[in-house]
Interface confidence: medium
């Protein structure tokens, strides 16, 4: 990947794509500046991942300015929370992990207000980005789905996210071509059952998305990204 942004400096509230090992470039926001006093995070930014609402510390070499990179990295992807993240970075860039637009963390408050650029003409964005959850490295590995439908894409789109039982007849309102596809889709769901059932209502998808450290190889990730282009609908429940 290009490292032309290695020397780029970011400020609190900046919108970026963040690259973590084994994961696609993920829509994210800079939530905290590097603190030289903290050895483990020196020269690293705390980033908040849209869609999953998790955080991690990343160096500038793994961060890419959102506006410049969205054409390259902003394509729908099958990873859980990715498409939602794309929507959030465009439509709700100040979202917090709790779902509340509350006051900023102290680490961001000292920064001058950052007015996010007006993406896709969305005129009602707020000012600077706000805080994130304090948890680091708690994200669950999103195992690649083994089964794909006949078109080679995963069926996970809003309006079709719930799993059907294997013998459940197809929704009559669904696309006609899907009748032959549903058999391959059983068991694929945007969120693991444990997360959905046990998470707090304010963070329904906590525990998803790019982890702080990931062992999955870049080669596998690249393969998944290629497979994922043109993700269809969330026909999986």
């Amino acid at each position: 990947m290009s490292r032309s942004n290695r020397q780029k400096e970011y400020k609190c509230g900046d919108l970026v794509f963040a690259k973590m090992k084994g994961y696609p470039h993920w829509p994210a926001r800079i939530d905290e500046m590097p603190e030289a006093a903290v050895k483990s995070t020196a020269n690293k930014y705390q980033v908040f991942f849209f869609g999953t609402h998790e955080t991690a510390f990343l160096g500038p070499k793994d961060l890419f300015p959102y506006e410049e990179s969205k054409e390259k990295f902003g394509k729908p992807n099958k990873r859980k929370g990715f498409s939602e993240g794309l929507w959030e970075i465009e439509n709700n860039p100040t979202v917090k992990a709790s779902g509340y637009q509350s006051s900023q963390k102290k680490s961001c408050a000292a920064e001058p207000e950052v007015e996010p650029e007006d993406h896709e003409g969305d005129g009602d964005k707020k000012g600077s980005a706000e805080g994130s959850s304090d948890e680091e490295g708690k994200l669950v590995i999103d195992e690649p789905a083994k089964e794909k439908n006949e078109k080679g894409t995963l069926k996970r789109r809003a309006g079709d996210v719930l799993e059907d039982s294997p013998k459940r007849p197809k929704e009559s309102g669904d696309h006609e071509e899907e009748d032959k596809e549903i058999a391959a889709l059983e068991g694929e769901r945007p969120l693991p059952v444990e997360v959905e059932k046990n998470s707090t209502p304010s963070e329904p998808d906590s525990g998803q998305g790019p982890p702080a450290e990931e062992e999955e190889g870049e080669e596998e990730a690249a393969k998944e990204e290629a497979e994922a282009q043109g993700v269809r609908d969330h026909e999986s429940l």
Epitope: G51, K75, P76, G81, F82, S83, E84, L86, W87, E88, N91, S98, G99, E120, G121, D122, G123, R156, R157, A158, G159, D160, V161, L162, E171, G173, D174, H175, R189, P190, L191, E196, P201, S202, E203, P204, D205, G230, V231, R232, D233, H234, L237
Partner: antibody, heavy 120, light 106 residues
Framework: QITLKQSGPGIVQPSQPVRLTCTFS??????????VAWIRQPSGKGLEWLAT???????RYNPSLKSRLAVSKDTSNNQAFLNIITVETADTAIYYC????????????WGQGTLVTVSA | DIQMTQTTSSLSASLGDRVTISCRAS??????LNWYQQKPDGTVKLLIY???RLHSGVPSRFSGSGSGTDYSLTISNLEPDDIATYYC????????FGGGTKLEIK
């Protein structure tokens, strides 16, 4: 700024076809992940989802109305269309279009609505 | 089809009150729930998506919670501008709206 505006014939006779137009700005229906949903509301009643057209034409319809509905789009002119093949008096309602994104989010931005009255 | 039920069709409250509007799904919808506000002039706005996430520009006095089949919208400090009808909507299997709860001032 994202805006949507519906337009239609206003009054139409029963059993006739109707074509409603949603003209929008601030987003494109050729952008991956974007859709336009159609919703209606009979006078004094609640909202009813009718259909959704996605950027890739992989569309969805309300099962109870599917046989009478068809959605289409003109991406170059930023327009989405809802065709009701044969209207009935029960189709009298305010019709809305709304922008929707591909995953786990709501009908984010709505038009102001257009009234369709089915009357002989 | 998934049915959405808002058992309270109308609700009267005083300014400054904390108001909770409930919504029930006919099956587990795994937090795939949105809330909308429709003003008397017909204008519709998305308030909350995915059970609890505030849409851009929505005041923080609005909050959402719930899981499984039961969900709620809470307005913590009722203001005159909140007078509207509120609809829940599931998007787990196609899209279905609840019948709406009309909020009025006492």
């Amino acid at each position: 700024q994202i805006t949507l505006k519906q337009s239609g014939p206003g009054i139409v006779q029963p059993s006739q076809p109707v074509r409603l137009t949603c003209t929008f700005s601030g987003f494109s229906l050729s952008t991956s992940g974007i859709g336009v949903a159609w919703i209606r509301q009979p006078s004094g009643k609640g909202l009813e989802w009718l259909a959704t057209i996605w950027w890739d034409d992989d569309n969805r319809y309300n099962p109870s109305l599917k046989s009478r509905l068809a959605v289409s789009k003109d991406t170059s002119n930023n327009q989405a269309f809802l065709n009701i093949i044969t209207v009935e008096t029960a189709d009298t309602a305010i019709y809305y279009c709304a922008q929707i994104y591909d995953y786990a989010v709501g009908f984010a931005y709505w038009g102001q609505g257009t009234l369709v009255t089915v009357s002989a | 089809d998934i049915q959405m039920t808002q058992t309270t069709s109308s609700l009267s409250a005083s300014l400054g009150d904390r108001v909770t509007i409930s919504c029930r799904a006919s099956q587990d919808i795994s937090n795939y729930l949105n809330w909308y506000q429709q003003k008397p002039d017909g204008t519709v706005k998305l308030l909350i998506y995915y059970t609890s996430r505030l849409h851009s520009g929505v005041p923080s006095r609005f909050s959402g919670s719930g899981s499984g089949t039961d969900y709620s919208l809470t307005i913590s400090n009722l203001e005159p501008d909140d007078i509207a009808t509120y609809y829940c909507q599931q998007y787990g299997k196609l899209w279905t709206f609840g019948g709406g709860t009309k909020l009025e001032i006492k």
